[in-house]
């Protein structure tokens, strides 16, 4: 059976397509090609008489067609109007006709797309943004990329208009992008330049750094305030409720105890109209803001119950500190046998009993800081009594 095949089936605009003929009868008188699904002289492309090798162009001939002796038809520089069906009619030598119909599809070489947006400066949690991939072309697949990744599944992302429009519902600051759209058809693909969103947000609750609360007199107090915000926040400082300055940094040299108080950072975003504040307490004191870790020592760690005594000592180089003791998470002393001495640096247990076995540690502290020692384990043994022979004479 006579058949035709398009090579290729999907053709890029401007390229060429060959309508190949299979199972062409051996003895032919002539053949004709037609645009469409039937023999129609109004749509004849070319008629070809084998014997005379004479080609007669028809009304559908554009000058871009070449017919070959094997009945194949080459169409060059194809346009989208060339898309469709093509019918070959062959006149066999016995004057019997045969027909075959084939088709191909012409697709444009796609241009570089671009992204248009209905709102390039949306406000976080308030605005929606619709991106549209331009241009609109027929037989085209539209794809979207965010941060070079295909679209995540999200209820805030909606595709419409044949995937040509991407809508972000209730934008967040993480939706800045970049966004790219890609257009595809069977013969070409092209991706837009990236587009980023300028999401207006904030300010968030400010953070004051450093986090230190305690300062020694004579030190410099340097505080910095930061609140996530777009556009960047405008900052101002208040001390004990009194406005100081409109800067992000607050610097007070050579502080005294009089500089103790509440320090407020005020962040403002003029676009969103939102304000946020954070209050930090600053204490200026001679006391060490950081107490070093104390060391704990025992006169012995393994003792005999009801016989031995033991001394535990807590050592620290810090001054102006207090010491307290803990045993099994309980504060000591917890019995008459436990005594504290030398400003609580020494814990004496006399005599040691079985219930005194376990973990001990000490803690040093001042009004603004504290630190614990590593734990120490006290083991309590009891000597075994010699057994008497209780056997009666036999």
């Amino acid at each position: 059976q006579l058949t035709t095949e398009s090579m290729p089936f999907n053709v890029a605009e401007g390229k060429e397509v060959l309508l190949l003929v299979h199972n062409l009868p051996q003895q032919l008188f002539g053949y004709s090609w037609y645009k469409g699904e039937r023999v129609d002289g109004n749509r004849q492309i070319v008629g070809y008489a084998i014997g005379t090798q004479q080609a007669t162009p028809g009304p559908a001939n554009s000058g871009r067609e070449t017919i070959y002796p094997n009945a194949s038809l080459l169409i060059q520089n194809v346009t989208q109007n060339d898309t469709g069906f093509y019918t070959l009619q062959v006149i066999k030598s016995d004057l019997v006709n045969e027909e075959a119909t084939g088709q191909f599809h012409v697709y444009p070489e796609l241009p570089k797309p671009s992204i248009s947006s209905n709102n390039s400066n949306p406000v976080e949690d308030k605005d929606a943004v619709a991106f549209t991939c331009e241009p609109e072309t027929q037989d085209t697949t539209y794809l979207w990329w965010i941060n070079n990744q295909s679209l995540p599944v999200s209820p805030r992302l909606q595709l419409s208009n044949g995937n040509r429009t991407l809508t972000l519902l209730s934008v967040t600051r993480n939706d800045t992008g970049p966004y790219e759209c890609e257009i595809q058809n069977p013969v070409s693909a092209n991706r837009s330049d990236p587009v980023t969103l300028n999401v207006t947000y904030g300010p968030d609750t400010p953070t004051i750094s450093p986090s230190d609360t305690y300062y020694r007199p004579g030190a410099n107090l340097s505080l910095s305030c930061y609140a996530a915000s777009n556009p960047p926040a405008q900052y101002s400082w208040l001390i004990n409720g009194t406005f100081q300055q409109s800067t992000q940094e607050l610097f007070i040299p050579n502080i005294t105890v009089n500089n103790s108080g509440s320090y407020t950072c005020h962040a403002n975003n003029s676009v969103t109209g939102c304000n946020r504040t954070t209050v930090k307490t600053i204490i200026v004191t001679e006391l060490s803001p950081v107490v070093a870790k104390p060391q704990i020592k025992a006169s012995k760690t393994t003792v005999t119950g009801d016989k031995d005594s033991v001394n535990l000592t807590c050592s620290t180089n810090d001054t102006g500190i207090s010491i307290r003791w803990f045993f099994k998470n309980q504060s000591l002393p917890s019995s008459e046998r436990m005594k504290l001495s030398q400003g609580n640096t020494t814990l004496s247990i006399n005599p040691v009993k079985r219930e005194d076995a376990g973990t001990y540690w000490c803690e040093v502290f001042n009004p603004i800081s504290k630190n614990q020692s590593d734990p120490i384990m006290l083991n309590v043994n009891y000597n075994a009594l010699p057994q008497e022979n209780g056997l009666s004479p036999g």
Epitope: V39, G47, T52, Q54, T56, D94, L95
Partner: antibody, heavy 120, light 106 residues
Framework: QVQLQQSGAELVRPGTSVKVSCKAS????????IEWVKQRPGQGLEWIGV????????NYNEKFKGKATLTADKSSSTAFMQLSSLTSDDSAVYFC?????????????WGQGTSVTVSQ | DVQMTQTISSLSASLGDRVTISCRAS??????LNWYQQKPDGTVKLLIY???RLHSGVPSRFSGSGSGTDYSLTISNLEQEDIATYFC????????FGGGTKLEIK
């Protein structure tokens, strides 16, 4: 130049047969078709059939199947039409014509015609 | 089968006239229409094929047009030698002729 020379006029009895010839010259005989056309006195043209001299393939008007038989002799570049079982209805001038293909068919050169008279 | 009809069987015209002869097909023949001239001596010539294409050697005063089922032959400047009968013919697998239009001088 292209010429189609037909045989002379025929006077024949009813019920007999007649064979009209058409000798082609001035072109390659086997690469065109030969068509046969009937014209009764004072009437229009009526297509009888066509032959491909290169292959002997034929196509007939349904009305003339069994009446006309088309043949061709490549060696003498001559086409023939035999009409059988003649009646007075067969009295006419018969033309042969060369036909070429352009997607359809057109008869571009014609013979001078052969008059066949069927009479007692 | 496709029937071809030439409704005007004869017409008279003066030399120099523009003459149009019409032909109708019983169905769309897709421009596969030919025109023939038969002189009074019986000789037949192809004038136009494929509706509007002039056969070689035919004077340019002859032209053809039409589409679908309606076709026409026009002689733009009638000459004495154009006195003849004109036949249309559809050129599909089974050819058929119109009844003819006889052109005479007034």
């Amino acid at each position: 130049q292209v010429q189609l020379q037909q045989s002379g006029a025929e006077l024949v009895r009813p019920g007999t047969s007649v064979k009209v010839s058409c000798k082609a010259s001035g072109y390659a005989f086997t690469i065109y078709l030969i068509e046969w056309v009937k014209q009764r006195p004072g009437q229009g043209l009526e297509w009888i059939g066509v032959i491909n001299p290169g292959s002997g393939g034929t196509n007939y008007n349904e009305k003339f199947k069994g009446k006309a038989t088309l043949t061709a002799d490549k060696s003498s570049s001559t086409a023939f039409m035999q009409l059988s079982s003649l009646t007075s209805d067969d009295s006419a001038v018969y033309f042969c014509a060369r036909s070429y293909y352009y997607g359809s068919f057109a008869m571009d050169y014609w013979g001078q015609g052969t008059s066949v008279t069927v009479s007692q | 089968d496709v029937q071809m009809t030439q409704t005007i069987s004869s017409l008279s015209a003066s030399l120099g006239d523009r003459v149009t002869i019409s032909c109708r097909a019983s169905q769309d023949i897709g421009n596969y229409l030919n025109w023939y001239q038969q002189k009074p001596d019986g000789t037949v010539k192809l004038l136009i094929y494929y509706t509007s294409r002039l056969h070689s050697g035919v004077p340019s005063r002859f032209s053809g047009s039409g589409s679908g089922t309606d076709y026409s032959l026009t002689i733009s400047n009638l000459e004495q030698e154009d006195i003849a009968t004109y036949f249309c013919q559809q050129g599909n697998t089974l050819r058929t002729f119109g009844g003819g239009t006889k052109l005479e001088i007034k």
